[in-house]
């Protein structure tokens, strides 16, 4: 069976974690309201029932207060993400209390028993939410619970258990192990706050699922399709993190959560939007870049609430790195005739020339196969802002890069040797961009000339309707 | 201002047990970790683990594991580090060094440490 | 664990004049933009001290004659001008993950 690898490392390490001899060891949770953007600061300890520190340490009762809920850990201390999340929440909010919950002792376990003590510390936030409702201006609408892995789930619990709604809890890669398929009462789920939004980065369809694939949300983002984010390979990591190990690919995709979060939070003039789309394959191919009717949304900190009938899936693609956004096309080829094809889906990439900048090179993914007389649907982004979309370059590869497609062309070959060259037809492309929402069709430059084959290029430029807008809102226009 | 006190040198014959205090005073005991860290003579520094002095809960690094236990008397905001079965070896300083349990947990205030010799 | 190699592992300097002391790292101790890369001055028989923190802080009460820089896994400490007190040894620590580990020291003495 697949090794059950965590956040920090392999569950089984802990069978052979120390107790804490002669020691005696306080089953608690601590709340320690970060003062300070300076991390080294001891910050202050709320406890209920005790109003001092409030006072003393500026408890604002009518901001906007924040929750930080770290997850399973085995080394006992807090992990690097949970500063810079803290000092993204004070750079964006200023006059925010934020406040980290502290279950170190109770998360510094077997994960199965850190699991088990999710309940209890999900007691304690809403106890703590409890007493400071009793206080004059404060408002459970004001509460944001932001969860990370297993700390999503506690979130919930702690969402379930108060007195009242609170306002929004944000899951960041809510844990898989043990809450996969749990019931809504055991995990976190929709009816835990007025607004509850998760993002996926790590869930895997094969093996152990380190995040929770179900939807648990309002609206549950899938980046990248939920499971490999670019950056995180073993290749990428060997280079540029602590260590080139398989727990740290692991960490790089789990942690991707809160970094988009805090992306969210310092970037707020580079916004990622996320789709709607039933799947991943169905968003791979391009067909779930609308805006329309609540379709698309901010994602992290600036996601506009949206409480659906259902869970939301949505989904997008972005950097390796910060600030994450891309921008997302779809492309439409209608495909009016090809020959001799052949057993082999041929390789196509596109080029764009915008007014701001021109894209790279970028492969068109054939999710399927290319149907004939068909229109074929494709996704392709990119990196920059390329501005008013002026033509386009398609290229259909030459020589064949894989061993497989070289196999499958002699295969031809031995069964049709005087096989006539392969081509095919298009006379248009429609793009429609997810970020502006505008559509476009581009038409081939010489209407006489619409064929391409293996080698060759085909060019297509702006035909002379212009830009076509639907009555479909720009993801843009709807920032909060 | 804030400080950490170790107890005095201590000269032990081999097979003998020790215990070493470190007292805090200036600043909230509990809302700092406290690390353990031994100098051999001639030699740089090792970490031995910490203990989290809030929760109890110690943590010992790989060379550590079996003759050493941390403890706390928070009451008295002292952490404790008793060595069993002493070798030869194990003379050396011992340092406590106190980390936050936030930021980049670098050890901040050290106590001026504590000489224990081991010889028969 | 993290390896710290320092170099060189003594140094002799006139007063006056600068002394560098650099610590590489087995693999990179930063985290995003943070460097969790540490300093520490130990003179004979006394604990060691925190000089810098987070690769190019300076502690509280340490002279600006100290000076840190470097990120990923090549840090340096920079001690200019050199000092007559300044006779120490010198270690690096990275505390990006448990176990915090130090490097093997540098000896400084003044000629």
């Known amino acids: 069976s697949p090794v059950p690898f965590g956040p920090e490392g392999r569950l089984e390490d802990k069978l052979h974690k120390p107790k804490a001899t002669q020691t005696e060891v306080k089953p608690s949770v601590r709340f320690n309201l970060r003062t300070s953007k300076d991390p080294e600061h001891e910050g202050c300890y709320l406890s209920v029932g005790h109003s001092q520190p409030l006072e003393d340490c500026s408890f604002n009762m009518t901001a906007k207060t924040f929750f930080i809920i770290h997850g399973w850990t085995m080394s006992g201390i807090f992990e690097n993400w949970l500063h810079k999340l803290v000092s993204a929440l004070h750079t964006r909010e200023k006059d925010a209390n934020v406040v980290v919950v502290d279950w170190l002792p109770l998360a510094h376990q077997l994960y199965t028993d850190a699991v088990n003590n999710t309940r209890v510390v999900g007691h304690s936030i809403a106890r703590m939410l409890d007493w400071l409702q009793e206080k004059d201006d404060f408002s459970l609408g004001n509460v944001h619970l932001i969860g990370y892995s297993l700390g999503a789930h506690v979130a919930g619990y702690a969402g379930n258990f108060v007195k009242g709604t609170v306002g929004r809890i944000t899951g960041l890669d809510p844990a898989g192990p043990m809450f996969e398929g749990a019931d809504i009462h055991k995990r976190l789920s929709p009816d835990d706050a007025d607004f509850v939004d998760v993002l996926h980065t790590y869930t895997r369809s094969f093996g152990l699922s380190i995040g929770i694939q179900m939807p648990v949300g309002h609206i549950d983002i899938y980046p990248n399709g939920g499971d490999f984010q670019p950056g995180c390979g073993l290749n990428d990591v060997l280079g540029s993190i602590a260590y080139g190990t398989i727990t740290e690919v692991v960490k790089c995709e789990h942690e991707r959560a809160v970094h988009l979060f805090v992306d969210s939070l310092v970037n707020q003039d580079k916004p990622s939007f996320a789709f709607q789309c039933t799947d991943s394959n169905r968003f791979k191919k391009g067909i779930c870049l609308s805006c329309r009717k609540n379709r698309c949304n901010s994602i992290g900190y600036n996601a506009k609430k949206m409480r659906n009938k259902r869970n939301s899936k949505m989904y997008l693609k972005t950097r390796a790195g910060m600030p994450f956004r891309v921008y997302h096309y779809q492309m439409k080829i209608h495909v009016f005739s090809y020959k001799n094809m052949g057993e082999i889906e041929p390789t196509f990439y596109v080029t764009l020339y915008g007014t701001n900048a021109d894209s790279q090179t970028l492969p068109l993914e054939i999710v399927e196969r290319i149907e004939q007389n068909a229109t074929n649907t494709f996704l392709v982004y990119t990196e920059e802002d390329l501005g008013d979309l002026l033509k386009i370059q398609l290229t259909w590869e030459g020589a064949s890069q894989s061993w497989y497609n070289l196999w499958k062309e002699f295969r031809s070959y031995l069964s049709q040797p005087r096989n006539p060259g392969r081509e095919l037809n298009i006379r248009r492309i429609r793009v429609k961009s997810g970020e502006t929402q505008r559509k476009l069709t581009f038409c081939t430059e010489d209407p006489e000339n619409t064929s391409i084959s293996p080698g060759r290029e085909l060019w297509f430029r702006k035909c002379r309707d212009g830009w076509r807008m639907k009555n479909e809102t720009s993801p843009t226009v709807e920032l909060p | 201002q804030v400080q950490l006190v170790q107890s005095g040198s201590e000269l032990k014959k081999p097979g003998a047990s020790v215990k070493v205090s470190c007292k805090a005073s200036?600043?909230?005991?509990?809302?700092?970790?406290l690390n353990w860290v031994r100098q051999a003579p001639g030699q740089g520094l090792e970490w031995m683990g910490w203990?989290?002095?809030?929760?109890?809960?110690?943590t010992y690094a790989g060379d550590f594991k079996g003759r050493f236990v941390f403890s706390l008397d928070t009451s008295v905001s002292t952490a404790y580090l008793q060595i069993s079965s002493l070798k030869a070896e194990d003379t050396a300083v011992y340092y406590c060094a106190r980390r936050g349990y936030y930021g980049r947990r670098f050890f901040d205030v050290w106590g001026k440490g504590t000489t224990v010799t081991v010889s028969s | 664990d993290i390896v710290l190699t320092q170099s060189p592992a003594s140094l002799a300097v006139s007063p006056g004049q600068r002394a560098t002391i650099t610590c590489k790292a087995s693999q990179s101790v930063d985290y995003d933009v943070d460097s969790y890369m540490h300093w520490y001055q130990q003179k004979p028989g006394q604990p060691p001290k925190l000089l810098i923190y987070a690769a190019s802080n300076l502690a509280s009460g340490v002279p600006a004659r100290f000076s840190g820089s470097g990120s990923g896994t090549d840090f340096t400490l920079t001690i200019n001008p050199v000092e007559a007190n300044d006779t120490a040894n010198y270690y690096c620590q990275q505390t990006i993950e448990d176990p915090p580990t130090f490097g093997g020291g540098t000896k400084v003495e003044i000629k």
């Open positions: 203990i989290n002095t809030y929760s109890g809960v110690p």
């Open positions: 200036g600043y909230t005991f509990t809302n700092y970790g």
